[in-house]
Interface confidence: low
């Protein structure tokens, strides 16, 4: 049996994945639950099994097709239901009319690489993954650099207000180890949120030349 309030949040990666998290205050006693996606204007539907991620929340990924296939458009709407088994039948625990392009969260940027590094600056590039062609150039990025002795939370955010898949980091300290992360967000969508941060890219600035001012 299930009691208590629940929260059901899903995001579309703009191509072929809807990721959902369902939080439930009351205890679930060995109950099997799933998310069912039923598009109003498509010839498919999809289900994924909710798996626990904490004491009171479960998550799953609806895989709609090949990673780069465009499975939904800006006018699609998908009825998403959380279904939990009660004996021989399924009970609807939560339901939402999901507008994919109003609830976007892209995949984290990939293929981070150092293009050029000097004593005080470093040029880094990256690629976006599984992002819809619908966005054209309507994307923005945030980047952060981890300096020695600091935490990621302390790192200042650098904002790129356009689709620019590179950055030139300035005023770095010579011969110093840094880490760099970037995330992406489409401009479209009322409930759109930032992608996860990319995997950190570690790099080291060049040492200052002997006898030169640093």
């Amino acid at each position: 049996a299930v009691n208590g309030t629940s929260q059901f949040t899903c995001f579309y990666n703009s191509r072929a994945n809807i990721s959902c998290v369902w939080s439930q205050d009351g205890a679930l006693q060995d109950t099997s639950c799933q998310v069912h996606a039923w598009p109003d204007r498509r010839r498919w539907n999809q289900t994924c099994e909710l798996l626990p991620v904490s004491q009171a929340s479960w998550a799953c990924n609806l895989i709609l097709g090949a990673p780069d296939s465009q499975k939904l458009t800006t006018v699609d709407i998908v009825t998403l239901r959380v279904l939990c088994r009660e004996g021989v039948r399924w009970r609807v625990m939560a339901i939402q009319d999901f507008k994919p392009f109003e609830n976007l969260r892209l995949m984290a940027p990939i293929s981070l690489q150092v293009v050029h590094v000097e004593t005080h600056r470093c040029n880094i590039s990256w690629e976006i993954s599984q992002a819809s062609h619908y966005f054209e150039r309507h994307l923005e990025f945030e980047a952060r650099t981890l300096s020695p002795g600091h935490t990621w939370e302390e790192a200042p955010l650098l904002t790129l207000k356009q689709k620019q898949e590179w950055i030139c980091l300035e005023t770095l300290t010579p011969d110093t180890q840094y880490e760099f992360q970037v995330r992406v967000k489409p401009l479209q969508g009322e409930f759109t949120t930032w992608s996860p941060w990319s995997q950190p890219l570690a790099f080291r600035t060049k040492p200052a030349a002997l006898g030169k001012d640093t």
Epitope: W38, D40, R41, T73, T74, V75, I77, T79, D97, K99
Partner: antibody, heavy 119, light 106 residues
Framework: EVQLLESGGGLVQPGGSLRLSCAAS????????VHWVRQAPGKGLEWLGV???????DYNAAFISRLTISKDNSKNTVYFQMNSLRAEDTAVYYC?????????????WGQGTLVTVSS | DIQMTQSPSSLSASVGDRVTITCQAS?????MYWYQQRPGKAPRLLIY???NLASGVPSRFSGSGSGTSYTFTISSLQPEDIATYYC?????????FGQGTKVEIK
């Protein structure tokens, strides 16, 4: 058999309101979206809005300030209300449903109900 | 809004003729639909997803196209095909229709 039956049309005064019903049979409005389309006399088709299976709505921006689409799941009926009517709102109003809930296109239409806005 | 421009606005052809109607969208669309409307009747879906024949629709009707340019064809016009034909895009809200093409028999 899927059927849609509109009712509520007739003569309305300018500035008045209109409430149409679309009674569905052969399917449930909790499983399928229902759209509204109108056609002025001798003119083309104009999409007005939709109510989705879960109850959320999308409207044509040209009508958003005076249009409300709602439904009563227990009666399996969708309602269309438009306020501040003017002569140019005179039209046949249709409710329509997409094909198999899984493919696009308005495969099912009501017979339409004529609304005349005149004093 | 995406404007849908149909041409011609009307045409007259003989029974057995091949009839072609074009629909030009003001910007690129992914999905195109075609409807037939006989006088005093509700529209009837003929073509969905640009080129797929709706249930019960004769094979003389066909559709094609992509991007901003779409075509609807009746391979051999029949007397019962006298009607107005509409294209419709389902890629961006508001959903929009062409102004219609009236088909008559010579």
């Amino acid at each position: 058999e899927v059927q849609l039956l509109e009712s509520g049309g007739g003569l309305v005064q300018p500035g008045g309101s209109l409430r149409l019903s679309c009674a569905a049979s052969g399917f449930t409005v909790t499983s399928y979206a229902v759209h509204w389309v109108r056609q002025a006399p001798g003119k083309g088709l104009e999409w007005l809005g939709v109510i989705w299976s879960g109850g959320s709505t999308d409207y044509n921006a040209a009508f958003i300030s005076r249009l409300t689409i709602s439904k009563d799941n227990s009666k399996n009926t969708v309602y269309f209300q438009m306020n501040s009517l003017r002569a140019e709102d005179t039209a046949v109003y249709y409710c329509a449903r997409a094909g198999d809930a899984n493919y696009d296109g308005f495969a099912y239409w009501g017979q339409g109900t004529l609304v005349t806005v005149s004093s | 809004d995406i404007q849908m421009t149909q041409s011609p606005s009307s045409l007259s052809a003989s029974v057995g003729d091949r009839v072609t109607i074009t629909c030009q969208a003001s910007s690129s669309v992914s999905f195109m639909y075609w409807y037939q409307q006989r006088p005093g009747k509700a529209p009837r879906l003929l073509i969905y997803d640009t080129s797929n024949l709706a249930s019960g629709v004769p094979s003389r009707f066909s559709g094609s196209g992509s991007g901003t340019s779409y075509t609807f064809t009746i391979s051999s016009l029949q007397p019962e095909d006298i009607a107005t034909y509409y294209c419709q895009q389902w890629s961006t809200y508001p959903l929009t229709f062409g102004q219609g093409t009236k088909v008559e028999i010579k």
